[in-house]
């Protein structure tokens, strides 16, 4: 099928970075400046994304791949391919429609994005509170109260590695 298609359609021979130019007898022409084609056989090149304003360029556009944007300091990416930049807040705060607000007592946010969340209720999971929560940190739950018999060694919580929201999609 592929061989038949290429015999019938000269455009299928045009590689990425070019387009099949109908105005020039279906010759493969290079993509004009600020445009790209990431696959072969395309009849047009796509306009490169421009990273402006709060967006900054993470990867320049080439003839075969689109530009990639991220956000300027003080903002973080949201959406597929960083389609939006949202304002950072401090840990211990959440971004509301009126700006950054401190977490209420009993809630925390250990990120620069997202909401303030209630502290974990250790007793609901049959455990006891080992370390109290703050605006910036959830409580740390330890062994169940029954396990805390005299002579039992206390548990040192491991240092957090990467929290939700800090890993690539």
């Amino acid at each position: 099928f592929e061989r038949t298609r290429s015999l019938q359609d000269p455009c299928s021979n045009c590689p990425a970075g070019t387009f099949c130019d109908n105005n020039r007898n279906q010759i493969c022409s290079p993509c004009p400046p600020n445009s790209f084609s990431s696959a072969g056989g395309q009849r047009t090149c796509d306009i490169c994304r421009q990273c402006k304003g709060v967006f900054r360029t993470r990867k320049e556009c080439s003839s075969t791949s689109n530009a990639e944007c991220d956000c300027t300091p003080g903002f973080h990416c949201l959406g597929a391919g960083c389609s939006m930049c949202e304002q950072d807040c401090k840990q211990g705060q959440e971004l509301t429609k009126k700006g950054c607000k401190d977490c209420c007592f009993g809630t925390f946010n250990d990120q620069k994005r997202g909401i303030c969340r209630p502290w974990t209720n250790c007793s609901l999971d049959g455990k006891s509170v080992l370390v109290n929560g703050t605006k910036e940190r959830d409580v740390v739950c330890g062994p169940s109260p029954a396990d805390l018999s005299p002579g039992a060694s206390s548990v040192t919580p491991p240092a957090p590695a990467r929290e939700p929201g800090h890993s690539p999609q």
């Epitope: 990416c77 949201l78 949202e86 509301t96 429609k97 990120q111 994005r113 997202g114 909401i115 209630p118 974990t120 209720n121 609901l124 999971d125 959830d138 409580v139 740390v140 739950c141 957090p160 590695a161 990467r162 929290e163 939700p164 929201g165 800090h166 890993s167 690539p168 999609q169």
Partner: antibody, heavy 117, light 106 residues
């Protein structure tokens, strides 16, 4: 490709417990909160709770507190939901759902569901 | 506890615009997410943070939120849009879903 695959259907007697698993693949399991939502036959969606896969921290809907336990095994990239003291009204499809990058409780990827009868 | 009210059903002719509402006290101050659920399938996020669209969701889907009402708008409705639609918010310590709206394409 990112997906959440849940364990198979279960039939339980009243008073028993059920434990449903949700295996994540195609993304960093520890980086995203995992939620559980259920749907009784012909009814709407009902949120049960979440787990932070990094810390194990949880939050449960008041309705289920004392009956539900949500845990995770980071080495297996799997979240679990255990519901105890089952009654007929607990017959439902149980879904796990990943919270998105905005971390505003938007559930951007769902498992296929597990029917518990 | 916080309550979200949706109309049980909405009917629309193909090619027309469907509007599904979600009512709640001062809902405009909250972030609203919308899900589409087709029979026998898991829900799919179609709008988040009031009006943002996940990748893969057509531009025909849009959202707005102010006062006491959030609205999901589906323009140029197609037969494939027939489904149940749920709104969702976060209120203090709980995720709350609306009762759902069945969209029928006539």
């Amino acid at each position: 490709q990112m997906q959440l695959v849940q364990s198979g259907a279960e039939v339980k007697k009243p008073g028993a417990s059920v434990k449903v698993s949700c295996k994540a693949s195609g993304y960093s399991f520890s980086g995203y909160y995992m939620h559980w939502v259920r749907q009784a036959p012909g009814q709407g969606l009902e949120w049960m709770g979440w787990v932070n896969p990094m810390s194990g921290g949880t939050n449960y809907a008041q309705k289920f507190q004392g009956r539900v336990t949500i845990t995770r095994d980071t080495s297996a990239s799997t979240a679990y939901m255990e519901l105890s003291s089952l009654r007929s009204e607990d017959t439902a499809v149980y879904y796990c759902a990943r919270e998105g990058m905005a971390m505003r409780l938007e559930l951007d990827k769902w498992g296929q569901g597990t029917l518990v009868t | 506890s916080y309550e979200l009210t949706q109309p049980p059903s909405v009917s629309v002719a193909p090619g027309k615009t469907a509007r599904i509402t979600c009512g709640g006290n001062n809902i405009g101050s909250k972030s609203v997410h919308w899900y589409q659920q087709k029979p026998g399938q898991a829900p799919v996020l179609v709008i988040y943070y009031d009006s943002d669209r996940p990748s893969g969701i057509p531009e025909r889907f849009s959202g707005s939120n102010s006062g006491n009402t959030a609205t999901l708008t589906i323009s140029r409705v197609e037969a494939g849009d027939e489904a149940d639609y749920y709104c969702q918010v976060w209120d203090s310590s709980s995720v709350v879903f609306g009762g759902g709206t069945q969209l029928t394409v006539l």
